[in-house]
Interface confidence: medium
C-alpha cells in the first residue's frame, strides 16, 4: 500500500481549525493477524529524506498522538490528553487518517507527517509516511478560511475547505 | 521434539568476543520470530534483539552496534555474535521463539561471564 | 527508552491468597502485544498469559490477565505452593522502532 496526501499545503488564518489529511492507497490487508499503527508528526525538509526528523506537535509526540488498531476497525485518539491541546487523530473505514488542530496561531506553521506502519506481527512490518505543509496567517493577507492545494498528483486547482 | 538448545556461552575477557548458537529442533527457523533475551545474576530479563520472519532484525538500543543476530536456516540455527563485550553483558542468554504474538518457546540459556 | 515498571517488586503471600501484580507502559501497548512470564530460579521462563487476557496452553485457570493501553494486571485468584516464583510482564512496541520491553520483575514469596 501507499500513503497519499490529498492537499501538500494548508493556508490558514489565526484561530481558525484544519484537519490534515492522509490517505491509504492499494491493497490493505484486512486480516486478523495484521494491525495498523498510525500517528502524526512535526518534522522539517531534510536533504535526505523529508519526515526522518520526528519532532511533537504542541509538545504531544507520536507515542501520544497514535492510533494502533485491527486492519477492519476505526480508531480515534484517546481524548484526555490531545483534546487539551486542541488535537485529535482519526482513523476510518475507508483508509482516511487525519489529525484536526484547534485555534491555529503562527506556531503551528510547518512541516507535518502522517506515519502508518502496516504490522504481521513478528512476520513483517511496512512503514510509509506523507508530508505536507501548514501555514498559519495573521494580517490583512490572510484568507478568511484555510485553503487547501492539492498534492502535484492532482488537480492543481485551490480548494477552499469548509 | 520441538526445542531450543543454547551453546556458546563462557568466560571472556572484556573487549572479546563471543558467538552464541541456538540450535532449533522440531520446526523450520525461518519459520517463525527468533529473539535473544539476557538475564545477569540475579536481575530481570532484558531484551537483546529479534529476527523476524522476514529477515528485518531489530535490537535494544544498548546492543546496536556491538551484537549482531543472525540465522542459518540450512542449520535451522540462529546466531548471536557480541563484540566489545563489558563486565554488565555478563549474564544467561536465552534464544526465543515468536510464537503468535509473543515468546512461546525458550531455551534453556547460556552463561556468558566477562571478566578478566 | 520505553520502560515497563512492575509493582510490587517483591510480595510475600500465603498459600490461598489473592495475588495482583501491575504492569505500568511508559507509552500506550496494544493489548494484542502483552504478555506475562513466570520464572523459577536456576530456570527458562515460562508463559503464562499472552494477548493481555488469554492463558497460554496447560497454565491453570487461577491466573488472569487484564488491562488495556498502559495498565495491565496479573491475577492469581488463590495462590498454590507451586505459584512462589518471578512474575514479568512484556510488551512489544513498534514505534519508533520495534522493541521488546520487560518489566522490572516481581518476585511472589511465601510469608
Known amino acids: 500500500f501507499k500513503v497519499a496526501t490529498p492537499y501538500s499545503l494548508y493556508v490558514c488564518p489565526e484561530g481558525q481549525n484544519v484537519t490534515l489529511t492522509c490517505r491509504l492507497l492499494g491493497p490493505v490487508d484486512k486480516g486478523h493477524d495484521v494491525t495498523f499503527y498510525k500517528t502524526w508528526y512535526r518534522s522539517s525538509r531534510g536533504e535526505v529524506q523529508t519526515c526522518s526528523e520526528r519532532r511533537p506537535i504542541r509538545n504531544l509526540t507520536f507515542q501520544d498522538l497514535h492510533l494502533h488498531h485491527g486492519g477492519h476497525q476505526a480508531a480515534n485518539t484517546s481524548h484526555d490528553l490531545a483534546q487539551r491541546h486542541g488535537l485529535e487523530s482519526a482513523s476510518d473505514h475507508h483508509g482516511n487518517f487525519s489529525i484536526t488542530m484547534r485555534n491555529l496561531t503562527l506556531l503551528d506553521s510547518g512541516l507535518y507527517c502522517c506515519l502508518v506502519v502496516e504490522i504481521r506481527h513478528h512476520h513483517s512490518e511496512h512503514r510509509v509516511h506523507g508530508a505536507m505543509e501548514l501555514q498559519v496567517q495573521t494580517g490583512k493577507d490572510a484568507p478568511s478560511n484555510c485553503v487547501v492545494y492539492p498534492s502535484s498528483s492532482q488537480d492543481s486547482e485551490n480548494i477552499t475547505a469548509a | 521434539e520441538v526445542q531450543l538448545v543454547e551453546s556458546g556461552g563462557g568466560l571472556v575477557q572484556p573487549g572479546g568476543s563471543l558467538r552464541l548458537s541456538c540450535a532449533a529442533s522440531?520446526?523450520?527457523?525461518?519459520?517463525?520470530?527468533m529473539g535473544w533475551v539476557r538475564q545477569a545474576p540475579g536481575k530481570g530479563l532484558e531484551w537483546v534483539g529479534i529476527?523476524?520472519?522476514?529477515?528485518?532484525?531489530y535490537y535494544a538500543s544498548w546492543a546496536k552496534g556491538r551484537f549482531t543476530i543472525s540465522r542459518d536456516n540450512s542449520k535451522n540455527t540462529l546466531y548471536l555474535q557480541m563484540n566489545s563485550l563489558r563486565a554488565e553483558d555478563t549474564a544467561v542468554y536465552y534464544c526465543?521463539?515468536?510464537?503468535?504474538?509473543?515468546?512461546?518457546?525458550w531455551g534453556q540459556g547460556t552463561l556468558v561471564t566477562v571478566s578478566s | 527508552d520505553i520502560q515497563m515498571t512492575q509493582s510490587p517488586s517483591t510480595l510475600s503471600a500465603s498459600v490461598g491468597d489473592r495475588v495482583t501484580i501491575t504492569c505500568q507502559a511508559s507509552?500506550?501497548?496494544?493489548?494484542?502485544?502483552l504478555a506475562w512470564y513466570q520464572q523459577k530460579p536456576g530456570k527458562a521462563p515460562k508463559l503464562l498469559i499472552y494477548?493481555?487476557?488469554t492463558l497460554a496452553s496447560g497454565v491453570p485457570s487461577r491466573f488472569s490477565g487484564s488491562g488495556s493501553g498502559t495498565e495491565f494486571t496479573l491475577t492469581i485468584s488463590s495462590l498454590q505452593p507451586d505459584d512462589f516464583a518471578t512474575y514479568y510482564c512484556?510488551?512489544?512496541?513498534?514505534?519508533?522502532?520495534?522493541?521488546?520491553?520487560f518489566g522490572g520483575g516481581t518476585k511472589v514469596e511465601i510469608k
Open positions: 522440531g520446526f523450520s527457523l525461518s519459520s517463525y520470530a
Open positions: 512484556q510488551g512489544t512496541f513498534y514505534i519508533p522502532d520495534y522493541i521488546d520491553g
Open positions: 494477548s493481555a487476557s
Open positions: 507509552q500506550s501497548v496494544y493489548s494484542r502485544y
Open positions: 526465543a521463539r515468536g510464537d503468535g504474538y509473543t515468546y512461546g518457546l
Open positions: 529476527i523476524i520472519v522476514s529477515g528485518n532484525i
